[in-house]
Interface confidence: low
């Protein structure tokens, strides 16, 4: 009679993560008597997957009833497959021996490849806010996918970005892979409502990419513009001066009025109006009693926005002239070193 052969008909098997893998194995003879064992890998470091004779293998079931005397089908099913299960599986026939069974013949092996979906991309932006015209970096990460071939794209408000670099790790063979991409985005004044999207396409997603998003509202800081104007007289000796704080984001803003360098009033922006582009406007006013001043008054509106150095704008109030004759003098000036912070 011809010597027993162990046949593994499938050179390779491809299974999606979470599914069940069927590894087929048949013997060509009932002789010699002895059990079958399944191993992952070959050589001394091989891992026992199933032993017909003894042991507890909760994820493994046999395809046929191995207790039947004439059974020659030793195929197994492995449930709930993960990328860590990838490898080459060998069906090995043992010959009954004393005290131990002796390995008799091995199948050629079946390579189990696992298709695993990438995790949802996580997009993260810079730790600190940045102002328009600055370039900021966003990173996108997705993990746990297999096979290695993957496509990643970046979009800003639906427009594809080109300034990015992507790495897939590890470079060599692995049970699963990770992708890491860094994109550079130039901020504009209109970006409060903008979104950056990282899109990952993989064979396991069947053409429906995964997306991760970041809102630029968490990244951008739009500094305010200031305008100080003198309003028409409210009373004989009173002048109303307003400070218009325009186009700022985020809302966190504190305003201080100074009269000739002395603090007159400090307030925090509360009732703001929102512009279409997501930025805010706010107005503060100061009522100045002209009769209390002998000389000209320098009124300064000083704004501290989102913890940044204060910016200010001043207005000279001439007290020599009668208030009614001043009209709407708007000869305002930027204060020295803060000029660069004014947009």
């Amino acid at each position: 009679e011809e010597e027993l052969q162990v046949i593994q008909p499938d050179k390779s098997v491809l299974v999606a993560a979470g599914e069940t893998a069927t590894l087929r194995c048949t013997a060509t003879s009932l002789i010699p008597v002895g059990p079958i064992q399944w191993f992952r890998g070959a050589g001394p470091g091989r891992e026992l997957i199933y032993n017909q004779k003894e042991g507890h293998f909760p994820r493994v079931t046999t395809v046929s009833d191995l207790t039947k005397r004439n059974n020659m089908d030793f195929s197994i099913r492995i449930g709930n497959i993960t990328p860590a299960d990838a490898g080459t599986y060998y069906c090995v026939k043992f010959r009954k021996g004393s005290p131990d069974d002796v390995e008799f013949k091995s199948g050629a092996g079946t390579e189990l490849s696992v298709r695993a979906k990438p995790s949802a991309p996580v997009v993260s932006g810079p730790a600190a806010r940045a102002t328009p015209q600055h370039t900021v970096s966003f990173t996108c990460e997705s993990h746990g996918f297999s096979p290695r071939d993957i496509t990643l794209k970046w979009f800003k408000n639906g427009n594809e970005l080109s300034d990015f670099q992507t790495n897939v790790d590890p470079v060599g063979e692995s049970v699963s892979y990770s992708i890491h991409s860094t994109a550079k985005v130039v901020l504009t004044r209109e970006d409060v409502h903008s979104q950056v999207i990282c899109e990952v396409a993989h064979v396991t997603l069947q053409g429906d990419p995964l997306r991760g998003t970041a809102n630029l509202s968490e990244t951008i800081r739009v500094p305010p513009t200031l305008e100080v104007t003198q309003q028409p007289v409210r009373a004989e000796n009173q002048v109303n001066v307003t400070c218009q704080v325009r186009k700022f984001y985020p809302q966190r803003l504190q305003l201080t009025w100074l009269e000739n360098g002395n603090v007159s009033r400090t307030e925090t922006a509360s009732t703001v109006t929102e512009n279409k582009d997501g930025t805010y406007n706010w107005m503060s006013w100061l009522l100045v009693n002209v009769s209390a001043h002998r000389d000209d008054v320098k009124l300064t509106c000083q704004v501290e926005h989102d913890g940044q150095p204060a910016v200010s704008k001043s207005h000279d109030l001439k007290v020599s002239a009668h208030p009614k004759e001043q009209g709407s003098n708007t000869a305002a000036e930027n204060t020295g070193s803060n000029e660069r912070n004014i947009y």
Epitope: D149, Q165, V168, E173
Partner: antibody
Framework: QIQLVQSGPELKKPGETVKISCKAS????????MHWVKQAPGKDLKWMGW????????TNADDFKGRFAFSLETSDRTAFLQINNLKNEDTATYFC??????????????WGQGTLVTVSA | DIVMTQSHKFMSTSVGDRVSITCKAS??????VAWYQQKPGQSPKVLIY???TRHTGVPDRFAGSGSGTDYTLTISSVQAEDLALYYC?????????FGGGTKLEIN
């Protein structure tokens, strides 16, 4: 259009140093890795390593560790290969090549014209 | 390292003929194979990547096929300008390795 223009041929003595440049144009330089490939006379192509043009991180193949250095001048969109302590077996044409832009998958869509380095006493 | 073997150093063909250049990897490279054409005194030009994807501008007479360890570059109707060296390269894992090349000669 996309171009990689390499510096001219070099004749060096054993023990000397050579630095080859590769200037890129027609694309965003920091989006694509720059690879270096050696072709000795009558021999096949051998990948030497690459440099990440965004982070500046070089990766040398095992056979090209020690005497071989990859560097960048990003503002000038130029990559460099420097070979120290030249040996006769370094005689070859050296190519820079732009890697495919999805991560580390490395096939090479665009190549420089090659720089012939001859090492002879 | 993955070894890429091009068993034919030379192949002779005639204009209009169909020719197949083969490449064998020392292990499964999961379709991560590129093919290059190098003409005398020139740098290599990529023809195919991911085993069968033609690079932009490559004539459709060039086709790549294969899986596992065995890959083929086929020129369906050889033209005189196809006289060149052809290299395969695996882009599966570093170090990226090339085959020894196959020189296509026109009768």
């Amino acid at each position: 259009q996309i171009q990689l223009v390499q510096s001219g041929p070099e004749l060096k003595k054993p023990g000397e140093t050579v630095k080859i440049s590769c200037k890129a144009s027609g694309y965003t330089f920091t989006n694509y890795g720059m690879h270096w490939v050696k072709q000795a006379p009558g021999k096949d192509l051998k990948w030497m390593g690459w440099i990440n043009t965004y982070t500046g991180e070089p990766t040398n193949a095992d056979d090209f560790k020690g005497r071989f250095a990859f560097s960048l001048e990003t503002s000038d969109r130029t990559a460099f290969l420097q070979i120290n302590n030249l040996k006769n077996e370094d005689t070859a044409t050296y190519f820079c090549a732009r890697g495919h832009h999805y991560g580390n998958y490395a096939w090479f869509a665009y190549w420089g014209q090659g720089t012939l380095v001859t090492v002879s006493a | 390292d993955i070894v890429m073997t091009q068993s034919h150093k030379f192949m002779s063909t005639s204009v209009g003929d169909r020719v197949s250049i083969t490449c064998k990897a020392s292990q499964d490279v999961s379709l991560a194979v590129a093919w290059y054409q190098q003409k005398p005194g020139q740098s290599p030009k990529v023809l195919i990547y991911w085993a069968s994807t033609r690079h932009t501008g490559v004539p459709d007479r060039f086709a790549g096929s294969g899986s596992g360890t065995d890959y083929t570059l086929t020129i369906s109707s050889v033209q005189a300008e196809d006289l060149a060296l052809y290299y395969c390269q695996q882009h599966y894992s570093t170090p990226w390795t090339f085959g020894g090349g196959t020189k296509l000669e026109i009768n």
